[in-house]
């Protein structure tokens, strides 16, 4: 159930075609989870500042049941910062990503939970 959320001040017209499926594919590969369980949410046009500057920036979160941890998170950061830099032109030093290891019982889906 990996869920990746990107809040950014980049305008929606700067989000390139195919960005959502690209995120989905890359996250599926990185987490080892099937693409059909990956959810991505890109929220553009936000009023944001990072370090006092309104240059392009992003505040992100990655929720997953397992597959979260020190080494894995470093790998995700490299992947996701790379995509945000390449596709949205956001410098990696203007990106925060919070990682959440979810308890299966606390994630609802399809009338139930993953527990």
């Amino acid at each position: 159930m990996p869920m990746f959320i990107v809040n950014t001040n980049v305008p929606r017209a700067s989000v390139p075609d195919g960005f959502l499926s690209e995120l989905t594919q890359q996250l599926a590969q990185a987490t080892g989870k099937p693409p059909q369980y990956i959810a991505v949410h890109v929220v553009p046009d936000q009023l944001m500042a990072f370090g006092g500057s309104s240059e392009p920036c992003a505040l992100c979160s990655l929720h997953s049941i397992g597959k979260i941890g020190g080494a894995q998170n470093r790998s995700y950061s490299k992947l996701l910062c790379g995509l945000l830099a390449e596709r949205l032109r956001i410098s990696p030093d203007r990106v925060y990503i919070n990682y959440y290891d979810m308890n299966a019982a606390n994630v609802g889906w399809n009338n139930s939970t993953f527990a």
């Epitope: 305008p11 989000v15 075609d17 195919g18 960005f19 959502l20 059909q36 032109r89």
Partner: antibody
């Protein structure tokens, strides 16, 4: 009404370059990624690549790297594709295309197409 | 790259008949598929997107179906204006490849 108006047919010599234009109307070019396609008898339709005008971000088909260069002139609402080192294999109809009016960031179903530009490479 | 295998390459049918054109992807494309119609000397026109959704202005006799690697375009009660070429195209990662096309001719 969204329209993509392409430049006219080109007859060019092998080894030369050609630049095809795609002038947009009915919307501002910076709002949407612009894509280019090649259609030849041998290879059906092929996606060459797309350019997001706001940022200049390119998404391309590795097969056409070194062959096609995509650019945008925001002031004139025009997208360009330059093809270089032309050979007979580059003889084809080239199209610019754009997705529909919603689904930012999603798969670019091509709802709007230019009328096509015929490029003929011949000595 | 994902390969799109379209069949048949051509078919000859009569007005009023129903036809099915199929497209097979070399891997799961998760319904990221479009169908286009192209008349001789004209640009392609979007018929179906996301495998099953009809584009604006497309008659209801057209219908897209499928999932995973197998997709179909059905045309019910063929009309004279339906003759031409049809192409599928996937959007599950670049390059976005097209099928080889199906030429629909009047019998």
């Amino acid at each position: 009404e969204v329209q993509l108006q392409q430049s006219g047919p080109e007859l060019v010599k092998p080894g030369a370059s050609v630049r095809i234009s795609c002038k947009t109307s009915g919307y501002t070019i910076t709002e949407y990624t612009m894509h280019w396609m090649k259609q030849s008898h041998e290879k059906s339709l092929e996606w060459i690549g797309g350019i997001t005008p706001n940022t200049g971000v390119l998404s391309d088909n590795q097969k056409f790297r070194g062959k096609a260069t995509l650019t945008v002139d925001k002031s004139s609402n025009t997208a360009y594709m330059e093809l270089r080192s032309l050979t007979s294999a580059d003889s084809a109809v080239y199209y610019c295309a754009r997705r529909g009016n919603n689904y930012y960031g999603s798969s670019p179903w091509f709802a709007y197409w230019g009328q096509g530009t015929l490029v003929t490479v011949s000595a | 790259d994902i390969q799109m295998t379209q069949s048949p390459a051509s078919l000859s049918v009569s007005v009023g008949e129903t036809v099915t054109i199929t497209c097979r992807a070399s891997e799961n494309i998760y319904s990221n598929l479009a169908w286009y119609q192209q008349k001789q000397g004209k640009s392609p026109q979007l018929l179906v997107y996301a495998a099953t959704n009809l584009a604006d202005g497309v008659p209801s006799r057209f219908s897209g179906s499928g999932s995973g690697t197998q997709y179909s375009l059905n045309i019910y009660s063929l009309q004279p204006e339906d003759f031409g070429s049809y192409y599928c195209q996937h959007f599950w990662g670049t390059p976005y490849t097209f099928g080889g096309g199906t030429k629909l001719e009047i019998k």
